[in-house]
């Protein structure tokens, strides 16, 4: 059986002030069944970044088309970056449950931080 | 080409048990979930229960009776089915999962069926 | 449970007419609905999926619409091959998948 592993590929990524950021995210298998969510931070506190099934997060877009099948492909942009966005994003894979879905892995996380500005 | 075919239909009376199978070709079966529907004489469509990894999920009306099961080495979906009753009478299919965008679970192929018969 | 209502029931149309089939849920679905179609005897066929987006290899004369609660199947120009029953399915919330109660169009 084809274990699932959560790619993101940069550990660090060096952004700009006002520019668009890409994070990457691909899984190898599309089980178990459930959802891949973005979080910015660990543990109780983190910050929900972005969700495809609910809420309203406008400055992210998805890399891949939406109405592609069976997609493995799960980056994001984060559009207008301000200092305020620098941290640890992660990818993670939930397994549905009811009612509440079940974090079941994480991917190990891109460091964003802000890189010099262009002279 | 994609191809489901399953077996294992038959008449049995209340109470017995079925095991129906689901033999599956032309794809990677193991990264995808699978489902069972069925479909009562001259009645809609009822989702009966959906397997991921070893995450199963069921409908109300099988919980604890029936039990889905997948052999990836075998490309086999299967079916246990337990105190069958007269009104578990039905076409049952087999059908591959598909998902859409970041989640979502329809079926975009299906096999022909195995009818069970519950009757005494 | 999400329920869906299909309407109407049977539609008795003629090759080459526009048809529109119905679905209904009892709540917000987004545009997790898909359809299909189901001739005698045989199994169901994906047609659409994510509200309006058709599947590899269907006709270009299938169209869905819809978001939210109401959702829209339309045929622009029924062939003869295209009798049969079609049915919508709910995936936004589940456990349990659930399927409209079909359409079915007949020859008139």
């Known amino acids: 059986e084809e274990e699932l592993q959560m790619i993101q590929p940069e550990k660090l990524l060096l952004v700009t002030v006002g520019k668009t950021a890409t994070l990457h995210c691909t899984v190898t298998s599309l089980l178990p069944v459930g959802p891949v969510l973005w979080f910015r931070g660990v543990g109780p506190g983190r910050e929900l970044i972005y969700n495809q099934k609910e809420g309203h997060f406008p400055r992210v877009t998805t890399v891949s088309d939406l109405t592609k099948r069976n997609n493995m492909d799960f980056s994001i942009r984060i559009s207008s970056i301000t200092p305020a966005d620098v941290g640890t994003y992660y990818c993670v894979k939930f397994r549905k449950g009811s009612p509440e879905n079940v974090e079941f892995k994480s991917g190990p996380g891109t460091e964003m931080a802000l890189g010099a500005k262009p002279s | 080409d994609v191809q489901l075919v399953e077996s294992g239909g038959g008449v049995v009376r209340p109470g017995e048990s079925l095991r129906l199978s689901c033999a599956a070709s032309?794809?990677?079966?193991?990264?995808?979930?699978m489902s069972w529907v069925r479909q009562a004489p001259g009645e809609g469509l009822e989702w009966v229960s959906t397997?991921?990894?070893?995450?199963?999920y069921y409908a109300d009306s099988v919980k604890g009776r029936f039990t889905i099961s997948r052999d990836n080495s075998k490309n086999t979906l299967y079916l246990q089915m337990n105190s069958l009753r007269a009104e578990d009478t039905a076409v049952y299919y087999c059908?591959?999962?598909?998902?859409?965008?970041?989640?979502?679970?329809?079926?975009?192929?299906w096999g022909l069926g195995t009818l069970v018969t519950v009757s005494s | 449970e999400i329920v869906l209502t299909q309407s109407p029931a049977t539609l008795s149309v003629s090759p080459g007419e526009r048809v529109t089939l119905s679905c209904r849920a009892s709540?917000?679905?987004?545009?997790?609905i898909a359809w299909y179609q189901q001739k005698p005897g045989q199994a169901p066929r994906l047609l659409i999926y994510?509200?309006?987006s058709r599947d590899t290899g269907i006709p270009a004369r299938f169209s869905g619409s819809g978001s939210g609660t109401d959702f829209t199947l339309t045929i622009s120009s029924l062939q003869s091959e295209d009798f049969g029953v079609y049915y919508c399915?709910?995936?936004?919330?589940?456990?349990?998948?659930?399927f409209g109660g079909g359409t079915k169009v007949e020859i008139k």
């Open positions: 032309g794809f990677s079966f193991s990264i995808y979930a």
């Open positions: 059908a591959k999962d598909s998902t859409v965008g970041w989640s979502g679970d329809f079926f975009d192929y």
């Open positions: 397997i991921g990894a070893d995450d199963t």
């Open positions: 399915q709910q995936y936004y919330d589940w456990p349990p998948f659930t």
């Open positions: 994510a509200a309006s």
């Open positions: 709540q917000n679905v987004r545009s997790d």
